[in-house]
Interface confidence: low
């Protein structure tokens, strides 16, 4: 069954199915591109992005990118197609209902990225280690 937050009326030109044949609809994501952030040394943070966007393509998911260097901290929130790399990285966790940050190797900065597939899921970004990828619940596709 499709969870309530993705129950939208079906437009034939917008239907996309995942590998299990479940119907997928355009995602609702926070979409503020790159903004300065005060999120630091916390288990989780809200994006503080007040722009909600409906993704252009049904296959796109929500993405958040947290970056820290000597000068500032930024948080990027966007929609993105998980079939395509983002910042040169594959979106490995695109099926997760929650945005669980994972560190990526980038010279000269600390770089975390997460992706997820529930409405506005990139509004709440999670750094806490209790939400690691060994948790099988987070690996479930949201269309069950």
């Amino acid at each position: 069954t499709i969870p309530p937050h993705v129950q939208k009326s079906v437009n034939n030109d917008m239907i996309v199915t995942d590998n299990n044949g479940a119907v997928k609809f355009p995602q609702l994501c926070k979409f503020c591109d790159v903004r300065f952030s005060t999120c630091d040394n916390q288990k989780s943070c809200m994006s503080n992005c007040s722009i909600t966007s409906i993704c252009e393509k049904p296959q796109e998911v929500c993405v958040a990118v947290w970056r820290k260097n000597d000068e500032n901290i930024t948080l990027e929130t966007v929609c993105h197609d998980p079939k395509l790399p983002y910042h040169d990285f594959i979106l490995e966790d695109a099926a997760s209902p929650k945005c669980i940050m994972k560190e990526k190797k980038k010279p000269g900065e600390t770089f975390f990225m997460c992706s997820c597939s529930s409405d506005e899921c990139n509004d709440n970004i999670i750094f806490s280690e209790e939400y690691n990828t060994s948790n099988p619940d987070l690996l479930l596709v949201i269309f069950q």
Partner: antibody, heavy 122, light 107 residues
Framework: EVQLVESGGGLVQPGGSLRLSCAAS????????MTWVRQAPGKGLEWVSV????????YYADSVKGRFTISRDNSKNTLYLQMNSLRAEDTAVYYC???????????????WGQGTLVTVSS | DIQMTQSPSSLSASVGDRVTITCRAS??????LNWYQQKPGKAPKLLIY???SLQSGVPSRFSGSGSGTDFTLTISSLQPEDFATYYC?????????FGQGTKVEIK
């Protein structure tokens, strides 16, 4: 062709209620966020409220928060604005508008209805 | 809320004139700035989005520029149908506030 047609405006006494409707056609209504914008006579534009395509996300201007409720019926391609506890300062033409949905157009309203006049007076 | 200030509030110009309207935001809004045209008794019409992108169907004599806090709408050669009121709007954050408008009148 994208069309937005508002209805439900009229004369109402202070403290009264009114429900505006906006019938949408010519586009896939349920994947667009929709907004209400108002314009008092001889004045500028004031954003009132927005609702996401699924109806799950809403925002309101402080001036109407707690009094106005935005909603939508995607099966009827219709947007609503329930206005309660109306005040004289709510007198305006109310426009229904479609919010552009993607990337650099986010937040811009690309199609507007012709508006419906709400007059709050005793 | 982010305050948007337009100048001038009104201007008189002739057909063929180059017209410039400015819009200033009370804080940086990156390029999240839109311009609308409104004629008396009509609904607003989107002209420019994202500070400088021309909306489909809008004549190329309209152009926008700026980023951060200062923005400009330029009409390169004013046409009779351009006499109207122009509004800027920030869409950087909710609520997406409008400027007070600039009325372009015939000289």
């Amino acid at each position: 062709e994208v069309q937005l047609v508002e209805s439900g405006g009229g004369l109402v006494q202070p403290g009264g209620s009114l429900r505006l409707s906006c019938a949408a056609s010519g586009f896939s209504f349920d994947i667009y966020a929709m907004t209400w914008v108002r314009q008092a006579p001889g004045k500028g534009l004031e954003w009132v409220s927005v609702i996401s395509g699924s109806g799950g996300t809403t925002y309101y201007a402080d001036s109407v928060k707690g009094r106005f409720t935005i909603s939508r019926d995607n099966s009827k391609n219709t947007l609503y604005l329930q206005m309660n506890s109306l005040r004289a300062e709510d007198t305006a033409v109310y426009y229904c508008a479609r919010r552009a949905q993607y990337r650099d157009k986010v937040g811009a309203t690309d199609y507007w209805g012709q508006g419906t006049l709400v007059t709050v007076s005793s | 809320d982010i305050q948007m200030t337009q100048s001038p509030s009104s201007l008189s110009a002739s057909v063929g004139d180059r017209v410039t309207i400015t819009c200033r935001a009370s804080q940086s809004i990156s390029s999240y700035l839109n311009w609308y045209q409104q004629k008396p008794g009509k609904a607003p019409k989107l002209l420019i989005y994202a500070a400088s992108s021309l909306q489909s169907g809008v004549p190329s004599r309209f152009s926008g520029s700026g980023s951060g806090t200062d923005f400009t709408l330029t009409i390169s050669s004013l046409q009779p149908e351009d006499f109207a009121t122009y509004y800027c709007q920030q869409s950087y954050s909710t609520p997406p506030t409008f400027g007070q408008g600039t009325k372009v009148e015939i000289k």
